[in-house]
């Protein structure tokens, strides 16, 4: 129960592609607003987006600050106008969210395809290192920074007069490729962190091919 | 927990095709690769080919190109092969096994497919 | 395509021994390397993957080493339950490869 015509927040959803996280939840307010705390499940609490007529709150600042601790945050519901107002029980109306670890749940973004260049028989297909907000010494880390070893690329190309595809696999961001002299090729790429148990997998990167306007190197 | 349960053994004629079947369940087939592997009698182990069922992508051994199709039905975690123009050098136990990126880390129970006139 | 050669193709052992074997692919497969034990009539189990990863429930008699073209399975003091044949398989590059296999039976 809580104070009269308010409602607690319901559906609360991590929302995390590349450490970018927005906390949404339901309902659109009418007469009330919401403010979120965060913290993790040693810390003290830390509110964010107050009395807001939201139901997103972007928790990224937060949550780069350390993206291997799990992370729990609250929807605080208040009467508009009178958010001093408490619920029957002294405090106000909140509803917990799902616990959320970033490091083993935000979502791989859609990878980008750098660059590719050819030398006689091999094919040099370079994974655009995506920058994430997450920081170390003032500077922002790329995907490969903060995943390490734990992100692999795989490679999936075919030759444009035909359907039969080939795969490949780094640990790095580049590929070395054999392909046939005189023949164009196709490539797509898609980001994975094997160690995990969902969100394992991005999705394919835009299909880029050889002999096209874009030509065989692209910065 | 996984597990990849394959149809049963299949006896078919030469020069007819065969589809196997192979259902995955303790995890989504779209998170991972799922591929097929053949071994005769008294030999080792042969790629044939894989699926990824995220995407529809195949990629085949080009000793079975042209002969085998792999298919993927996210909506039943169910992984698909078919053999066809079979001959007797088809005769064999054919797994399903799940790739996880880093090993093809589980494995069916395999499916006895064997080839005669 | 990507050949694995597999040694030996197999070899006796006794009870508490170590044994190695090895596993030389025809070019950089950057640890896309995993090891599988197989006994009769059984499907393939998963023993080291990434080339150095003990695979869940795997004892840690076994374990795996290896980068760039050259791979190493050892097993430490080996038991009976040891004997089968194991194999290597890369998965860096389409079409994957198998190496031929161990054949390992203990004296």
């Known amino acids: 129960s809580g104070t009269t015509n308010t409602v607690a927040a319901y559906n609360l959803t991590w929302k995390s592609t590349n450490f970018k996280t927005i906390l949404e939840w339901e309902p659109k307010p009418v007469n009330q607003v919401y403010t979120v705390q965060i913290s993790t499940k040693s810390g003290d609490w830390k509110s964010k987006c107050f009395y807001t007529t939201d139901t997103e709150c972007d928790l990224t600042d937060e949550i780069v600050k350390d993206v291997k601790q799990t992370y729990l945050a609250r929807v605080f519901s208040y009467p508009a106008g009178n958010v001093e107002s408490t619920g029957s029980a002294g405090e106000p109306l909140y509803e917990n969210s799902p616990e959320f670890t970033p490091y083993l749940e935000t979502n791989l973004g859609q990878p980008t395809i750098q660059s590719f260049e050819q030398v006689g028989t091999k094919v040099n297909v370079t994974v655009e290192d995506e920058r994430t907000l997450v920081r170390r010494n003032n500077t922002f880390l790329s995907l490969r920074d903060v995943f390490g070893k734990d992100l692999i690329y795989t490679l999936y190309y075919w030759k444009s007069s035909s359907s039969g595809k080939k795969t490949a696999k780094t640990n790095t961001n580049e590929f070395l490729i054999d392909v046939d002299k005189g023949e164009n090729y196709c490539f797509s790429v898609q980001a994975v962190i094997p160690s995990r148990t969902v969100n394992r997998k991005s999705t394919d990167s835009p299909v880029e091919c050889m002999g096209q306007e874009k030509g065989e190197f692209r910065e | 927990q996984v597990q990849l349960l394959e149809s049963g053994a299949v006896l078919a004629r030469p020069g007819t095709s065969v589809k196997i079947s192979c259902k995955a369940s303790?995890?989504?087939?779209?998170?991972?690769?799922m591929h097929w592997v053949k071994q005769r009698p008294g030999q080792g182990l042969e790629w044939i080919g894989g699926?990824?069922?995220?995407?529809?992508?195949?990629m085949y051994d080009p000793k079975f190109q042209g002969r085998v199709t792999i298919t993927a039905d996210t909506s039943t975690s169910t992984v698909f092969m078919e053999l066809s123009s079979l001959r007797s050098e088809d005769t064999a136990v054919y797994y399903c096994?799940?790739?996880?990126?880093?090993?093809?880390?589980?494995w069916g129970q395999g499916t006895l497919v064997t080839v005669s006139s | 395509d990507i050949k694995m050669t597999q040694s030996p193709s197999s070899m006796y052992a006794s009870l508490g021994e170590r044994v190695t074997i090895t596993c030389k692919a025809s070019?950089?497969?950057?640890?896309?390397l995993s090891w599988y034990q197989q006994k009769p009539w059984k499907s393939p189990k998963t023993l080291i993957y990434?080339?150095?990863s003990l695979a869940d429930g795997v004892p840690s008699r076994f374990s795996g080493s290896g980068s760039g073209q050259d791979y190493s399975l050892t097993i430490n003091n080996l038991e009976s339950d040891d004997t089968a044949t194991y194999y290597c398989?890369?998965?860096?590059?389409?079409?994957?490869?198998f190496g031929g296999g161990t054949k390992l039976e203990i004296k």
């Open positions: 096994a799940r790739d996880s990126g880093y090993a093809m880390d589980y």
């Open positions: 303790g995890f989504n087939i779209k998170d991972y690769y």
């Open positions: 699926n990824d069922p995220a995407n529809g992508h195949s």
């Open positions: 070019q950089d497969i950057k640890s896309f």
């Open positions: 990434y080339a150095t």
């Open positions: 398989l890369q998965h860096g590059e389409s079409p994957y490869t």
